[in-house]
Every structure is written in structure tokens, then in C-alpha cells.
Interface confidence: low
């Protein structure tokens, strides 16, 4: 059959070379002459040549030695073609399997290794691990296992089989009893390394053991008892370095101190910790001491190691009585943040409230008052009462100085001490809101056809708050009602300007009063433009070119010319009577709106 | 006229403080706040900070555990300090008025600067 | 912080030329409140102080001649010199005063050519 079983070579094969591996044949050549070719990495692509076959007899050929730790395996195809070039069977596997042979030692992954270990540590304890690695096949055969061994221990007191190594694992640990640091600090030992699971070749590296101290010595107090002064009211103030001597070694974790409060300290005013150089506790304050309160503390201090102790020691303890020294102390705002309620633009004079301020002091001391931030300059304060009164217009919809209704005042209050103390309190005015703006109308310019005009929607505005807003009312002043209307909407919160009769193209002012639901009334003139134009519109078109429609008949131009001197001198005769002088562009819009009455019957 | 005048030491070693004083005139420092903005040689500004007229302070953050700006109204100084100085700190330092104190003046824009004063840092 | 970013960096005109110069924030600068665009620019010339030209992105400093003109909303912006002088020579910058710490553009230098 066209099968070729997985074919087994050793590495490192002496030859020699070609060396015949497997014979390829195909029961096809009965029929016709076979040529044999094989490809795959190792024949035609790289590593090319590694492999070859005769071309007529079909024997697989190994061509140099092979490197399993290179290349464990290659997957080859064999092909068969008849003379003319056409295959006559499907590509063939040809698996290669390299077997290994003991070409490699053992490497340890570093020259020298660290650990430590407690003195005086049970037999067991585990020190360190050390890892060496062996290139060999470690699956198939013990070229590449390796066994783990001490040669050699320096020194070798109190004897020369302290440690041990496991075969398999490389984990050092401690064999015997009796390890002293203050005797031996530090072991050296040798390892070895073997492959064929400790039958075959060897390396050595070096493993150092340190000899830790442990925790044998309880640290002490020098002295027992301290006495310090403190001011009050200061945090983070350091009140006193306590002093220990360990005899364990310096800066280990059996000699590092840990400080403890143990008593005296029920208000949790002090904390202590230990000073990273001179292993020294320093006693601060965590909170400020209150010389009214109590003017002396005695606190316990016990101290002990960072490390727990190897044997049953006593644990010392610290006194130190903390003397409270009185200073002069801040007046307090009550409460430090007030929220008051104040109408805006109440008159100036108007008292807005009394924010007064305490001294912790027991000396009965004389607090004077001032305005530290007024941002707007609304207010003044009574230095003696803490009376806070109105100077300016508090106006809540001023958004420069007001977020919220609320204007931010910080005041400051003075005590007559040596030397004097400030505190300073926050006062929130909350501004309640009245009636002092009218409704404004959005946009104040508009531009609208004469001719089929669509009405302009307005927004309206009004600073104030509910119930000083909407719904509002709306109504034309100064004669703007004879061509235009203004309508509030249902929701009562836009106005609809309509132009209601004919105007030339030109600009014009519509005055529209706007009222609130207070009845507070704001007049404001809209800019208006009208264009010659049908319908909506937003910039005016070139100049309005009239016309007079068909034929354009002598007649009809007569008529025009009497109708508009009839206007003109109606027009003289109204503007004597009763018109005033700022109706003077409606009028001249009313003649042409007759030439255009006129103008559309002629047609 | 409003003037406002740079004072500073030209040369400092790093790691050690530069105190700048920023001396004004035609103005008084309870109406304007006054910035500091440095500019390192070839390059362009950076805010520093500013102190307004009441003594508060906004800085960069960037620099502002290095920064301090405080202020003597009557003397009508301002001053900066800046500590642990490096190289990279060396540049021409500026003091330079608000337009005004509200926001509504565009305090945010600077009107008048100082000549500005050379700091090299340097060893 | 707000990065102000200017562009181009440097251009060479000839006097009488019209120029523009643009900066853009990476965030908005108008402030809804108000309708105000927190944007300044200033001039520095050779050796001198700078010295503001615009506020609110476009309300000229007093003694500021009207050939300056500041425009733009938002994020971008653009400083117009309609006809260039050769006093105009100096860096440009635009500075934000919208949020802390208050940032300046990179500069745009204007060489004469």
C-alpha cells in the first residue's frame, strides 16, 4: 500500500550519509514507470536538503545528522508520478520522529541563590528553591530529568548536614536543629544538578542561606516616665520622642519598634508612631487639645516589635503626662454656615439678620465684627451686634452675584486676645423673589410680508420667579393697534404679532406693552421690517416693483392720480387735526395702500 | 498710568526658591486682580495663577504645590513664590493686570503686563 | 486642562495683504448664561510684553486699531488683520478664560515679507 509508518532516526547519527531511511513504492508500477519526489520543510523548503529520495527506487534518504532539540519532528509528503508528469497517487504522510540522545547537561537558572531562614527554626522549615533546566527529552527519557543534590555546606558547624535539598523539587529546606545566628549569619552550599535522574551528567551552582534574627530581646523604655507641654488646638504638634533599646539586630523587623497608646487617651487626641531612623515613638496630637476642657493628659505607651516574639518576653510600658497650655482661641460662628431668608430690594438701612459668633476663651472676651466677602457690596455688619443691614439693592436675578437665589456673604469676627484670633462664618442669603421685572419679548426685531403676512410667534420672558411670570398679557400702545394685533397665547407664554392692514415696504416701530400675572407692565418696541413680499420672509427682496396689471388704460392711471391727491390731502387735513408726527410712515403707507386698492379694482 | 513693574533674583541654583515682586502703579490692587504667566525662552505663555482682590488665589494646577501668590495692598506689591526650582522652570516671568474684577469686565483677559524679569535656573 | 491649538504656526505676507490666523479649543467656550465666548488674543512683538488686542473673542481693547477683528463662537475662532502693516510683525496668541488654569494657544508668528 501507498502508507509509510512514522519513521524513528536518533540525533546526532554518525552516517554515513545519504543514509537510507524507508523505501517509497507504489503498487502502480506495474503499470507504467514511477518517480518518486518528496517536499515539506526538511526536503524542498527549509531546512532544504535535511532529506531527499532516489528518484526511481523511491528509498527515503536522511542526508546529515539531525538536532532533536533543534527539530523533534518533520511531516513530509512523498508524491508518485507516471512518465509523462501525471500523479498516479494522492500525497503521502511521511512522519519522522528525531529521538533524543544525553547531548545536553543541566543549567541552574542563576550562578547563585538567595534565602533566608529564622534561627532556631524547627527541622522542615523551607528556606529557598532553586530550578535548574536540562534541553533533553524529559517525556520519553531521563536524559532530561534532573536530580537536585548538596555537595557541600561552609561552614559546617555545629555540623556539616544543616540542609537538604529534595531530588526532584530543588526545595531547600532545614535539616538539623541548632541554627544561631549571633554563631553563624550565613551558610554556603554547593548544589548539584545531575541528569538521567542523578545518573548522568552533572552542574553545580551556589545557594546562600542568611540566618535571620529572631525575636529574642524585648525592646525597652529609657526612661520609663515623660512630661511635656503642648499648646491647644494644635494638630499634628508633636508632644514628646519616646526612646527604646533592642538588643536584637538593628533596623530588622525584631528590632523595629511599634508603639501603642494602651490608656489615658479616651478622647483618641494622640497618636504615636515610630520613627523610621532612630526607632524613637513621637507623640503627636491627632486632634487639638482644649485647655478649658482639660489641661492634662497622662497616656500609657506600650511598646513592641514589628516582629512577633520568638520567646515569652515582657512587654514594657511608657508614662508621659501631657500638659495642656492655654492660647488664645478663634470666636466660632453659630452655627458657621446661616441660611436667612431676605426679600430682594428691600430698602437700604433694612436690618437682613444678626449673626453672632462665640469664643471657646473662658476670659470674657470682646468680639468685633466685619464683612470679609460681600461680592456685590449689598451689605454692612455692626462690628459690635453682628447686625447685618442692607447698603445696596439685593437683586436675585442678578446672575453676576446670585446662583440659585442664594448670595454668598463671608464675615469675619475679631477677638480683643493677645494676639487676636479670627474665624469667619458664611451667611446664605436665600433672596425671595418679587415683582420688579416686567415680560420682554424675543426676538425685537422681525421682518414680515405685507402681503399675506404670517404672524410672528414672540417668546416672552420675565426674569422673576412664579407666580410674578406668566400668564402674560399683551396689548399695543401708541397707535401700533390700527396696523397690527398682539395676541397671548393659551399657555399664556408667547405673543403672536400680526400685521392686520397693508404697510409699505419700510421699517417700524410696534410698541407693545407686556404684563405679567403680578400686573407688573414692561413697553418694549419691536423693530419691525415689512417687504414688498407674499407670505413668509426672512430678509426683504430687492425694491417692490408695482404694476397695473393687462392693458394699463389712460383711465385707470387718471383715476390713480385722484385717488392718491384725495389721500394726500386727507391726509393733510388728519395730520392737522390729530396725528402725530411718528404716524407720519403708516400714513405714507395708507396712501400707497390706496394706490393699491386702486390699483387692484383697475385690474 | 498703569504700570506694573518685575523684580526677581536673574539667577537661582535648582532645587532652591525664586521670590518674584510685581510692583504696581495707576491702580490699586483692592480693584484688580493680577496674574503671573511665564514664558520660557523660544516659547510661548503659560498661566501661572492669580490673586484676587480680596487675597484669594486660584493656581495651575499643574504647579500648585510649588506655587504661592500673596499681596500687600497698601504697598501696592504682589508677589510669587515658587520652590524646588528646575531647569525646565527657567523663563521670563510676568505679572499682568486683569481687565477688571467682575466677570462681566472679561476679567479672564490681561490688559497691562509688566517688562517681564529673566529667571535662569542654573547651577 | 483646555488645550488651545493655533494654526499655522508661521506665515509670511506682504504689507497691505488681508490675514487669518485660527485657533480652536478642544471645548466649547461660549458660556450659555451669558452668550459670552471666553477668548482672548493678544500681540507680542520682538522683545516687548504681549499685549491684548480682543476680548470676548471679538470686542476690540481700547487704542486697538480697527484692522484688528476677532471672530468665531464655540470652539473655533480666528483673528483677521484686514491690511497688514509691518509694525503688525510679532507671535499671536489666544488665551482661554473659560476654566482654570486659564491656557494660551502656541502662537501664530507673522513675518513680513
Known amino acids: 500500500d501507498w502508507v509509510v509508518a512514522p519513521i524513528s532516526v536518533p540525533e546526532n547519527g554518525k552516517g554515513p550519509f545519504p543514509q537510507r531511511l524507508n523505501q517509497l513504492k507504489s503498487n502502480k508500477d506495474r503499470d507504467t514507470k514511477i518517480f518518486y519526489s518528496i517536499t515539506g520543510p526538511g526536503a524542498d523548503s527549509p531546512p532544504e536538503g535535511v532529506f531527499a529520495v532516489e528518484k526511481e527506487t523511491g528509498w527515503l534518504l536522511l542526508n546529515k545528522p539531525l538536532d532533536r532539540e533543534e527539530i523533534a519532528k518533520y511531516e513530509l509528503f512523498g508524491h508518485a508520478v507516471s512518465e509523462n508528469g501525471a500523479s498516479v497517487e494522492d500525497p503521502m504522510n511521511i512522519s519522522i520522529i528525531v529521538t533524543d540522545q544525553n547531548d545536553h547537561k543541566p543549567k541552574f537558572t542563576q550562578d547563585t541563590f538567595r534565602g533566608s531562614v529564622l534561627e532556631g527554626v524547627l527541622p522542615g522549615t523551607s528556606v529557598m528553591q532553586v530550578t535548574a533546566t536540562d534541553e533533553d527529552d524529559a517525556i520519553y527519557t531521563y536524559n532530561g530529568v534532573v536530580a537536585y543534590s548538596i555537595h557541600s555546606q561552609e561552614p559546617k558547624d555545629p555540623h556539616d548536614l544543616m540542609f537538604t535539598i529534595h531530588r526532584s523539587t530543588g526545595t531547600i529546606s532545614v535539616i538539623s536543629s541548632g541554627l544561631d545566628r549571633e554563631k553563624v549569619p550565613e551558610y554556603t552550599l554547593t548544589i548539584q544538578a545531575t541528569d538521567m535522574d542523578g545518573d548522568g551528567s552533572t552542574t553545580t551552582a551556589v545557594a546562600v542561606v542568611e540566618i535571620l534574627d529572631a525575636n529574642d530581646n524585648a525592646p525597652m523604655f529609657e526612661p520609663q516616665k515623660y512630661e511635656a507641654w503642648v499648646p491647644e488646638n494644635e494638630v499634628g504638634h508633636e508632644v514628646q520622642r519616646l526612646t527604646v533599646t533592642d538588643l536584637d539586630v538593628p533596623n530588622s523587623p525584631a528590632w523595629r519598634a511599634t508603639y501603642h497608646i494602651v490608656g489615658g487617651d479616651d478622647g483618641d487626641h494622640f497618636t504615636i508612631t515610630t520613627h523610621p531612623e532612630t526607632n524613637q515613638g513621637v507623640l503627636t496630637t491627632k486632634k487639638g487639645l482644649d485647655f478649658e476642657a482639660q489641661d492634662q493628659h497622662t497616656l500609657y505607651v506600650e511598646v513592641t516589635n514589628e516582629a512577633p516574639f520568638a520567646v515569652k518576653l515582657p512587654t514594657a510600658t511608657a508614662t508621659v503626662v501631657v500638659h495642656v497650655k492655654d492660647v488664645n482661641e478663634a470666636p466660632v460662628f453659630v452655627p458657621p454656615s446661616k441660611v436667612v431668608e431676605v426679600q430682594e430690594g428691600i430698602p437700604t438701612g433694612e436690618p437682613v439678620c444678626v449673626y453672632t459668633a462665640e469664643d471657646p476663651d473662658k476670659e470674657n472676651q470682646k468680639i468685633s465684627y466685619r464683612i470679609l466677602r460681600d461680592p456685590a457690596g449689598w451689605l454692612a455688619m455692626d462690628p459690635d451686634s453682628g447686625q447685618v443691614t442692607a447698603v445696596g439693592t439685593l437683586d436675585r436675578e442678578d446672575e453676576q452675584f446670585v446662583r440659585n437665589n442664594i448670595y454668598e456673604v463671608m464675615v469675619l469676627a475679631m477677638d480683643n486676645g493677645s494676639p487676636p484670633t479670627t474665624g469667619t462664618g458664611t451667611l446664605l442669603l436665600t433672596l425671595i423673589d418679587v415683582n420688579d421685572h416686567g415680560p420682554v419679548p424675543e426676538p425685537r426685531q422681525i421682518t414680515i410680508c405685507n402681503q399675506s403676512p404670517v404672524r410672528q410667534v414672540l417668546n416672552i420672558t420675565d426674569k422673576d420667579l412664579s407666580p410674578h411670570t406668566s400668564p402674560f398679557q399683551a396689548q399695543l400702545t401708541d397707535d401700533s393697534d390700527i396696523y397690527w394685533t398682539a395676541e397671548v397665547n393659551e399657555e399664556g407664554d408667547t405673543v403672536v404679532l400680526s400685521l392686520k392692514k397693508f404697510l409699505k415696504q419700510d421699517t417700524y416701530d410696534v410698541h407693545l406693552s407686556l404684563s405679567d400675572h403680578g400686573n407688573k407692565e414692561q413697553l418694549t418696541v419691536i423693530r419691525a421690517t415689512v417687504c414688498d413680499c407674499h407670505g413668509h420672509v426672512e430678509t426683504c427682496p430687492g425694491p417692490w416693483k408695482g404694476g397695473s396689471g393687462g392693458g394699463g388704460s389712460g383711465a385707470g392711471v387718471i383715476a390713480v392720480i385722484v385717488v392718491v391727491v384725495i389721500a394726500i390731502v386727507a391726509g393733510i387735513v388728519v395730520l392737522v387735526i390729530s396725528r402725530k408726527k411718528r404716524m407720519a410712515k403708516y400714513e405714507k403707507a395708507e396712501i400707497k395702500e390706496m394706490g393699491e386698492m386702486h390699483r387692484e379694482l383697475n385690474a | 498710568v498703569q504700570l506694573l513693574e518685575e523684580s526677581g533674583p536673574g539667577l537661582v541654583a535648582p532645587s532652591q526658591s525664586l521670590s518674584i515682586t510685581c510692583t504696581v502703579s495707576g491702580f490699586s490692587l483692592t480693584s484688580y486682580p493680577i496674574n503671573w504667566v511665564r514664558q520660557p525662552p523660544g516659547k510661548g505663555l503659560e498661566w501661572l495663577g492669580v490673586?484676587?482682590?480680596?487675597?484669594?488665589?486660584n493656581y495651575n494646577s499643574a504647579l500648585k504645590s510649588r506655587l504661592s501668590i500673596t499681596k500687600d495692598n497698601s504697598k501696592s506689591q504682589v508677589f510669587l513664590k515658587m520652590t524646588s526650582l528646575q531647569t525646565d522652570d527657567t523663563a521670563r516671568y510676568y505679572c499682568a493686570k486683569s481687565r477688571g474684577v467682575y466677570d462681566f469686565d472679561g476679567r479672564g483677559a490681561m490688559d497691562y503686563w509688566g517688562q517681564g524679569t529673566t529667571v535662569t535656573v542654573s547651577s | 486642562e483646555l488645550v488651545m491649538t493655533q494654526s499655522p504656526s508661521s506665515l509670511a505676507v506682504s504689507v497691505g495683504e488681508k490675514v487669518t490666523m485660527s485657533c480652536k479649543s478642544s471645548?466649547?467656550?461660549?458660556?450659555?448664561?451669558?452668550?459670552?465666548?471666553?477668548l482672548a488674543w493678544y500681540q507680542q512683538k520682538p522683545g516687548q510684553s504681549p499685549k491684548l488686542l480682543i476680548y470676548?473673542?471679538?470686542t476690540r481693547e481700547s487704542g486697538v486699531p480697527d484692522r484688528f477683528t476677532g471672530s468665531g463662537s464655540g470652539t473655533d475662532f480666528t483673528l483677521t488683520i484686514s491690511s497688514v502693516k509691518a509694525e503688525d510683525l510679532a507671535v499671536y496668541y489666544c488665551q482661554q478664560y473659560y476654566s482654570y488654569p486659564y491656557t494660551f494657544g502656541g502662537g501664530t508668528k507673522l513675518e513680513i515679507k
Open positions: 471645548q466649547s467656550l461660549l458660556y450659555s448664561s451669558n452668550q459670552k465666548n471666553y
Open positions: 490673586i484676587w482682590t480680596g487675597g484669594g488665589t
Open positions: 470676548w473673542a471679538s
